[in-house]
């Protein structure tokens, strides 16, 4: 059955309640210089209205503080209102290493990111840090790497490993959850000139992730004791016509091309899914495509296999698919899939259908295919036009969390966290945020607060309290001081 009745119950005490933000652009200078200037000034208020320095007088300055960054103060205020336990954000690789290698490290950018993490920890909020977060509009690579063919060039994977190592070294004492790459399976939207570009770039992304994971495992895990994975875009697929065999096959093929493409080599075999490889090869043989999945060497298979500490999935919606034979040598046509928009379903302004049961099906599919491992939903959300009373978002959160709870309670999926997407929206972009682009709070925040404080959807009489050892102890005085801090 697609929909089952709501359940009452709670998530475990160590469940991560998170909120996700995309790339944080580092502020280059702290915006409160008044504390670092040792000079005394007299303000000529009635005359020329200028400040005149008083010579010979030097005041005591205070050291620079993280909250001097205006940007950080804003984020902390928003996070405090969210009442989350975890904050997922992404670093900007191009800002940290503008030359693409360790010859020029932007220490100020690293200091900024360290501040975001350490100030969050003061509020009892742990960070899940994403090292690389490409978007359709912005590949996010340092410029020199772009000029050398970006992800089509195997040396970009080595450059990524060096960058990851720097981040582990500089932030790893404070960060215990790492995502190497956000949605590498969606870079097909960018590397789309040919299927071979798509599969070549994907191959180098897989290698980049594996190199970073191996580096962490070897060099940093013993002391830092964190966990590293990568986030896959993981929408569920359903046959448009459940009575057509070809539609069922298309739905499974979608999952193979979208999720298994990256999951199989990392979680299971070290190689691409046999079904995907065979499907592309069969189209190649029939002259319908010149695409081919890269052949992996034994060394590459060994490198890739098992390089995840948990499964991280970004899930937003369920797609209705049907089979349609497509000619052409691009990833989109290699899949032979056509998407159908079901107009009877509740949908968002960007036409994301609200289909809560899809997330439960996804979680069961992942466990069935890749075994019983810790799973985090590292991004999940919907765009809602409302600037204050965002009812669609509240409905979405409630229903999707219900299905995640069913997966935990009934299906016994080891779900460890849910990260709502996203903290604040960007100007002239779809409205996914809990806060507007000018930091105004929406009513879905209270809804999410309530779910977090209840740890789900408890029975009337059940306690939502966890023992102090398991729950972060909140220091009320600290919180008060942080909020009052200039």
């Amino acid at each position: 059955k697609e929909s089952t009745p709501d359940v009452q119950g709670q998530f475990p005490c160590d469940f991560s309640w998170g909120v996700t933000e995309s790339v944080l652009k580092p502020e280059s200078v702290a915006s409160s210089p008044q504390f670092s200037d040792p000079h005394l000034y007299v303000w000529n208020a009635t005359g020329n209205r200028l400040l005149h320095r008083v010579e010979g007088v030097r005041l005591k300055t205070r050291p620079a503080q993280c909250t001097d960054f205006v940007n950080i103060k804003k984020q902390l205020e928003m996070l405090a209102r969210m009442k989350v336990t975890h904050y997922r954000f992404a670093l900007d690789w191009a800002s940290v290493l503008p030359t693409g290698n360790l010859s020029a490290v932007n220490r100020q950018a690293l200091r900024y990111y360290r501040c975001v993490v350490s100030e969050g920890l003061k509020l009892g909020i742990s960070a899940m840090v994403t090292l690389y977060y490409p978007t359709h509009a912005h590949l996010g690579l340092p410029e020199p790497l772009l000029h050398a063919d970006g992800w089509l060039n195997p040396s970009t994977a080595e450059a990524f490993q060096a960058y990851a190592g720097l981040c582990f070294q500089e932030l790893g004492d404070l960060v215990k959850l790492w995502i190497t790459i956000n949605e590498p399976n969606r870079l097909s939207d960018i590397y789309n000139r040919s299927g071979n570009d798509t599969y070549g770039a994907a191959h180098n992304l897989l290698v980049a992730h594996a190199l970073a994971w191996r580096l962490y495992d070897r060099q940093f895990r013993p002391s830092q004791r964190g966990a590293v994975s990568l986030s896959l875009h993981a929408d569920w697929a359903e046959p448009a016509n459940p009575y057509a065999d070809s539609h069922w096959r298309a739905a499974e093929r979608f999952l193979q091309f979208e999720i298994a493409w990256f999951a199989e080599p990392l979680f299971k075999t070290g190689d691409y899914p046999a079904a995907m490889r065979e499907y592309i090869a069969s189209k190649h043989r029939r002259g319908l495509s010149s695409s081919a999945l890269p052949r992996l060497t034994e060394a590459e298979r060994r490198l890739l296999k098992g390089t995840v500490d948990f499964c991280a999935l970004n899930h937003f919606t369920t797609r209705f698919v049907m089979h349609e034979q497509l000619a052409g040598s691009r990833y989109d046509s290699d899949r032979d899939i056509q998407f159908l928009q079901d107009i009877t379903r509740l949908s968002s302004p960007t036409r994301l259908a609200v289909i809560p049961w899809g997330v439960r099906k996804l979680l069961r599919w992942v466990r069935r295919n890749y075994g019983d491992m810790d799973i985090y939903i590292t991004a999940s959300g919907i765009d809602d036009q409302a600037l204050e009373d965002d009812r669609l978002r509240k409905y979405y959160l409630g229903k999707y969390l219900q299905e995640v709870l069913k997966a935990y309670l009934i299906d016994k999926v080891r779900i460890k966290g849910y990260y709502a997407f996203k903290l604040a929206e960007e100007k002239s972009k779809p409205r996914f945020g809990f806060f507007t682009s000018d930091f105004k709070a929406k009513s879905s925040i209270q809804f999410y607060n309530k779910v977090i404080s209840s740890r789900g959807f408890p029975f009337e009489n059940s306690s939502s309290r966890c023992s102090q050892t398991q729950e972060n102890t909140e220091c009320t005085v600290c919180l008060f001081l942080v909020q009052k801090k200039p």
Epitope: P144, L146, H147, D149, G150, L152, R193
Partner: antibody, heavy 122, light 107 residues
Framework: EVQLQESGPGLVKPSQSLSLTCSVT?????????WNWIRQFPGNKLEWMGY???????NYNPFLKNRVSITRDTSKNQFFLKLNSVTTEDTATYYC???????????????WGQGTSVTVSS | DIVMTQSPSSMYASLGERVTISCKAS??????LSWFQQKPGKSPKTLIY???RLVDGVPSRFSGSGSGQDYSLTITSLEFGDVGLYYC?????????FGAGTKLKIE
């Protein structure tokens, strides 16, 4: 500022080889980009001849494939064009140009040399 | 090879006039098209890339449009310095191929 400068003989005899040099300043040819040779015939028609990439890989116009080769000297930051068995049809102005990588912020031809005129005549 | 058919081969236009030059590819080139200007005795200069993106420093009176197989370059208000040869180039596939050129003159 990136600059490209072509050099080579202005006159070549038929059946001989034409050799041109492109000297690049302001950017290392091993750091990135595709380094191309393009020629313009007397009637203004333009023809792409081939490229050598930042990593030394090259690609040629199939129309010229067995006659053309593009190589480089990374120590001098130069790349070269060699065209064998020339005929009068190869009389043209030869340009070296730089092309951005696909998927980069600028993926087209950006810098051109000023061109060098080559006449094939006995 | 992809064939680029450019039209017109030459044209006269008045100062201040709006000028449009067209290029048709023999197959879909997915916006991998650029436009060049060449003045007599000079090397070509790139004006537009990716069909509609203006190169830094190029006056905003130049604009590019189109997709699939059909593309055009527009000069909104012709100036005296705009005379010369204009070419389109497809770079979706190697070998790169050029249009035959349009000679633009002031009448």
């Amino acid at each position: 500022e990136v600059q490209l400068q072509e050099s080579g003989p202005g006159l070549v005899k038929p059946s001989q080889s034409l050799s041109l040099t492109c000297s690049v300043t302001g950017y290392s040819i091993t750091s990135g980009y595709y380094w191309n040779w393009i020629r313009q015939f007397p009637g203004n028609k333009l023809e792409w001849m081939g490229y050598i990439r930042y990593d030394g890989n090259s690609n040629y116009n199939p129309f010229l494939k067995n006659r053309v080769s593009i190589t480089r000297d990374t120590s001098k930051n130069q790349f070269f064009l060699k065209l064998n068995s020339v005929t009068t049809e190869d009389t043209a102005t030869y340009y070296c140009t730089r092309k951005g990588a696909y998927y980069s912020s600028f993926d087209a031809l950006d810098y051109w040399g000023q061109g060098t005129s080559v006449t094939v005549s006995s | 090879d992809i064939v680029m058919t450019q039209s017109p081969s030459s044209m006269y236009a008045s100062l201040g006039e709006r000028v449009t030059i067209s290029c048709k590819a023999s197959q879909d080139i997915r916006s991998y098209l650029s436009w060049f200007q060449q003045k007599p005795g000079k090397s070509p200069k790139t004006l537009i890339y990716r069909a509609n993106r203006l190169v830094d420093g190029v006056p905003s009176r130049f604009s590019g449009s189109g997709s699939g197989q059909d593309y055009s370059l527009t000069i909104t208000s012709l100036e005296f310095g705009d005379v010369g040869l204009y070419y389109c180039l497809q770079y979706d596939e190697f070998p790169l191929t050029f249009g035959a050129g349009t000679k633009l003159k002031i009448e």
